[in-house]
Interface confidence: low
């Protein structure tokens, strides 16, 4: 670009408003009025002390996904749309977003969008579209704590019946085994476990970096409980937001690190 | 304006460590990376390493990684270079270098000069 | 590592006249994804930091002259200045930012007859 200081034409950051339910994917498109030889496009979430915290990157024909992989920043096309989505939206996703541009090299242009605000709400039980409301029985707030206390004993009933089947089926059950998952089983996922999204990099030629992974946790015997607590995520640093899906795996390097791998 | 404003000029005897502070203005100093780089008396250019001011992650030239320790404070917008085990071969001007995107050193520091002089 | 090798070590020329700078890499700087290559030119005069001149190999840095301009692929890399003025007198580095370690060519000190 050997001229890249004519003034920046204006970004765009769309919808002004979104407003998505927890675990949906929440969308914005950010636009380039045109498109510059270099750039980076990074997005940002405006933190509650006004500060921009970069979400991801995108600059020329790579993708920097940032630290949480639940960002994905996507090229449309046309070459001036960009998709910026927060997969599986978190009700803590709530907040100010924006986009940036930055001409390369200096004179560094540097523009930031419009903000744009996202709500993130609760993800409601009921199907959205409801009959005609039924004639009023219990009030909601009732009803839900009727429903909950029957769900509780119900439960309870349940575990205990299964402790009895249990205890009747392997009266000379081992006390104090420990069995623990081995390493190159993976780990199974009920309904409510948290998925796992991929960042489709399309036919982008990356070179993996491994971060360390965390040492499998010793197993504690004489324990009838077991909780298996994941912290898939790195520490965030001062002032960032924490994330419990930043995923501490391999990480494709930054756009910035030339082909070679990172570290040597 | 993008401006990289370095400490000021240090002798340090053989054996000691020096820090090397820049003070970034200008950009969201968060969004890239902050590279050192060293031009010694008769030699070029030699490449430390650089640091993220985003998390702190490090890349060092092997030949300085055990001697170099990047780190960066974003509160003052700060990056600095610490050489430890200092010795003759170590005199030179440090610069501090932002890579805007890709790794060409776009903006520089001033320089600092270290000596080393017992 | 990569090594830079450039060549010659220094030149002299007079106004008005073009020079060229060489710089070899120990190994292809060309990326194949995205058909880029990985080098970077610097211009340091005397007493002051270090200039971006080039970078991609041939895109000029915003507000360099035209008289300077980057050319080669893979291993072989050429700066070339035209129409040589007075102020152009320091030393030029070329760059691989191809992989870590980055690395510069020992210099090529240029001065003005």
């Known amino acids: 670009l050997d001229s890249p200081d004519r003034p920046w034409s204006p970004l765009t950051f769309s919808p002004a408003q979104l407003t998505v339910q927890e675990g949906e994917n929440a969308t914005f498109t950010c636009s380039l009025a045109d498109i510059p030889d270099s750039f980076v496009l990074n997005w940002y979430r405006l933190s509650p002390r006004n500060q921009t915290d970069k979400l991801a990157a995108f600059q020329e024909d790579r993708i920097e996904p940032g630290r949480d992989r639940r960002f994905r920043v996507t090229r449309l096309p046309n070459g001036r749309d960009f998709h910026m989505s927060i997969v599986a939206a978190r009700l803590n996703d709530s907040g100010i977003y924006l986009c940036g541009a930055i001409y390369l090299p200096p004179n560094t242009q540097i523009n930031e969008s419009p903000r744009a605000e996202l709500s993130v709400t609760e993800r409601t039980l009921e199907p959205p579209t409801q009959s005609p409301s039924p004639p009023p029985r219990l009030s909601g707030q009732l009803q839900g704590l009727v429903i909950g206390v029957t769900s509780v004993l119900v439960g309870v009933l349940l575990l205990l019946l299964l402790t009895w089947v249990l205890a009747a089926v392997f009266p000379r059950a081992t006390r104090g085994a420990c069995v623990c998952g081995s390493e190159d089983e993976p780990l199974k996922e009920g309904p409510d476990a948290a998925p796992v999204f991929t960042l489709d990099y399309g036919e982008l030629d990356f070179q993996w970096r491994e971060k360390t992974p965390e040492p499998p946790a010793p197993c504690a015997p004489e324990q009838t409980e077991y909780a298996t607590i994941v912290f898939p995520g790195r520490p965030a640093s001062p002032g960032r937001r924490a994330s419990a899906s930043s995923l501490q795996g391999a990480q494709p390097p930054s756009p910035e690190d030339g082909p070679g791998l990172w570290p040597l | 304006e993008v401006q990289l404003v370095q400490s000021g000029a240090e002798v340090k005897k053989p054996g000691a460590s020096v820090k090397v502070s820049c003070k970034a203005s200008?950009?969201?100093?968060?969004s890239f990376w902050m590279n050192w780089v060293r031009l010694a008396p008769g030699a070029g250019l030699e490449w430390?390493?650089?640091?993220?001011?985003?998390?702190?992650?490090?890349h060092y030239n092997q030949k300085f990684k055990d001697r170099a320790i990047l780190t960066v404070d974003t509160s003052t917008s700060t990056a600095y270079m610490e050489l430890s085990s200092l010795r003759a071969g170590d005199i030179a001007v440090y610069y501090c270098?932002?890579?805007?995107?890709?790794?060409?050193?776009?903006?520089w520091g001033q320089g600092t000069l270290v000596t080393v002089s017992a | 590592e990569i090594v830079m090798t450039q060549s010659p070590g220094s030149l002299a020329g007079s106004a008005g006249e073009s020079v060229s700078i060489n710089c070899k890499s120990s190994?292809?700087?060309?990326?194949?994804?995205?058909?880029?290559?990985?080098l970077a030119w610097y211009q340091q005069k005397p007493g002051e930091s270090p200039k971006l001149l080039i970078y991609w190999a041939s895109t000029r840095e915003s507000g360099v002259p035209d008289r300077f301009s980057g050319s080669g692929s893979g291993t072989d890399f050429t700066l070339t200045i035209n129409n040589l003025q007075a102020e152009d007198v320091g030393v030029y580095y070329c760059q691989q930012y191809y992989s870590n370690p980055y690395t510069f060519g020992q210099g090529t000190k240029l001065e003005i007859k």
């Open positions: 270098a932002t890579q805007f995107g890709f790794s060409w050193l776009a903006y």
């Open positions: 190994q292809s700087l060309l990326y194949s994804s995205n058909q880029k290559n990985y």
């Open positions: 430390i390493g650089r640091v993220d001011p985003y998390d702190s992650e490090t």
């Open positions: 200008g950009y969201t100093f968060t």
